[in-house]
Interface confidence: low
């Protein structure tokens, strides 16, 4: 029920090494490039999958900030430090001894500084946007079936709790999904909204983490839907800190 | 095959502290977490605290904090539980037991035979 | 801290009854609860583990179910070998927490 037991695969991850030399010779699974071990149950944390990525080909990627306080991952990859249980540490620094401090779902919330800059906690991501852009199609999807089809997405393949899908908006042939989670809500084996987003990230752009299965091929009472654009903007529980040169 | 041989028995003053090492052997040590549960004489089974044999990074139940320590020799396949300031209520049964890393594992699959610390002036 | 509450703390039963030990948990912890059997001066072994997975070795008499907060350990068939105490765990979230235990005796 974790990791495959016949041939030893991390069916929620496929970055990872597996073997059968766990507790009582079940397969444990280890993230690439941390050697961490992982829950194949569930979602691998967006850390452990970005320091997987790091062990790869680097493919930088950019995004736009489009208000005030949403944040979006401008800054493309980079390796970060996880902590024990799989999250992003508070504070990320590079190889340069450049600081910065990162949310829950690791995207930078401040500016850059030194080794003397302190990020007295990993804020939480509690509200993330996912806007997409899909391709034509001969007419508009049906707003209810394409929320259905959605939140069945969520819940089904990632995972993540009904209550954490808020809203699917849809002006064609624009859609918007928002996963809203306060720390208050996430109990102990939830899966992140964060994680959640990252592993539908990666789905859309045909990078599926995971194993064997297809790419994901999204339907609508039986109408492709292909995503030719997506953009996430992630709303903190604190509002970042920017000097104001950043913001005009 | 696999187990886990704990050291003999010890008698200890009051305010005392106490090492008790755990070998590991039949098994690679650093992909199974290992636990540290304490039993006192007639009573129930109580979590101390594990460490992740892969990261070294231990947790400790809050009752214990300030007064236990887990370690680990990776190379002798060894762990070890420290408890300071010793009470005689402290007197139990010291187990430690293999689990997986994440939660879904933190289940005990296999037990040391345990070590009977005795507090006693 | 997650409690757990064992029912009942002591039964006594004889060779072949069907016996059932329960285990509520104070708050929901989805389907991490393991089950222990523990004989005078042994370390406890492990019986049950995910609520209803049973351990390699151990007799298909032994069974385990729920999910939630209410889970139950069921021997069908008693033999002589299983008069002992039996715990139920937590591993849901640290502190791991184990129910009181139960005694079970051969009556």
């Known amino acids: 029920h974790t990791a495959a037991q016949d041939n030893c695969t991390c069916p929620t991850n496929k970055m990872t090494v597996c073997s059968p030399d766990g507790p009582g010779g079940r397969c444990q699974c280890r993230a690439l490039g941390s050697g961490m071990a992982v829950d194949c149950s569930t979602l691998t944390s967006k850390c452990l999958l970005l320091k997987a990525r790091m062990s790869a080909p680097k493919n930088a990627r950019t995004l736009v900030r489009p208000s005030e306080h949403a944040l979006v991952d401008n800054d493309g990859l980079y390796d970060p430090d996880c902590d024990p249980e799989g999250r992003f540490k508070a504070r990320q620094c590079n190889q340069t001894s450049v600081c910065w401090c990162v949310n829950s779902v690791g995207v930078r919330r401040t500016d850059k500084g030194d080794l003397s800059l302190r990020c007295d906690e990993l804020v939480r991501t509690h509200h993330i946007l996912i806007d997409l852009r899909h391709r034509p199609t001969a007419g508009a999807f049906n707003h209810s079936d394409l929320d259905a089809e959605l939140r069945r997405l969520f819940r089904e393949r990632y995972r993540l709790h009904p209550k954490f899908v808020a809203a699917v908006h849809y002006e064609q042939p624009t859609i918007q999904i928002e996963l809203r989670q306060n720390t208050s809500q996430k109990a102990a084996g939830d899966v992140d909204i964060g994680d959640a987003a990252y592993y539908f990230e990666r789905d859309i752009k045909g990078e599926s983490l995971f194993q064997g299965r297809g790419g994901l091929d999204l339907r609508v009472r039986g109408e492709p839907l292909q995503v030719e654009r997506t953009l996430i903007y992630y709303l903190d529980e604190i509002p970042p800190k920017f000097s104001m040169k950043r913001l005009t | 095959q696999v187990q886990l041989v704990q050291s003999g028995a010890e008698v200890k003053k009051p305010g005392a502290s106490v090492k008790v090492s755990c070998k590991a052997s039949g098994y690679t040590f650093t992909t199974a977490g290992m636990q540290w549960v304490r039993q006192a004489p007639g009573q129930g089974l109580e979590w101390m605290g594990w460490?992740?044999?892969?990261?070294?990074?231990?947790k400790y139940a809050e009752d214990f904090k300030g007064r236990v320590t887990i370690s680990l020799d990776t190379s002798t396949s060894t762990a070890y539980l420290q408890l300071s300031s010793l009470k005689s209520e402290d007197t139990a049964v010291y187990y430690c037991?293999?689990?997986?890393?994440?939660?879904?594992?933190?289940?005990?699959?296999?037990w040391g035979q345990g070590t009977l610390v005795t507090v006693s002036s | 801290d997650i409690v757990m509450t064992q029912s009942p703390s002591s039964l006594s039963a004889s060779v072949g009854d069907r016996v059932t030990i329960t285990c509520k948990a104070s708050?929901?912890?989805?389907?991490?609860v393991a089950w222990y059997q523990q004989k005078p001066g042994k370390a406890p072994k492990l019986l049950i583990y995910s609520a209803s997975y049973r351990y390699t070795g151990v007799p298909s008499r032994f069974s385990g179910s729920g999910s939630g907060t209410d889970f139950t350990l069921t021997i069908s068939s008693l033999q002589p070998e299983d008069f002992a105490v039996y715990y139920c765990?937590?591993?849901?979230?640290?502190?791991?927490?184990f129910g009181q235990g139960t005694k079970l005796e051969i009556k």
């Open positions: 460490i992740n044999t892969h990261s070294g990074v231990p």
């Open positions: 765990q937590q591993h849901y979230i640290t502190p791991l927490t």
């Open positions: 037991a293999r689990s997986g890393f994440g939660s879904s594992y933190w289940y005990f699959d296999v």
């Open positions: 708050q929901d912890v989805s389907t991490a």
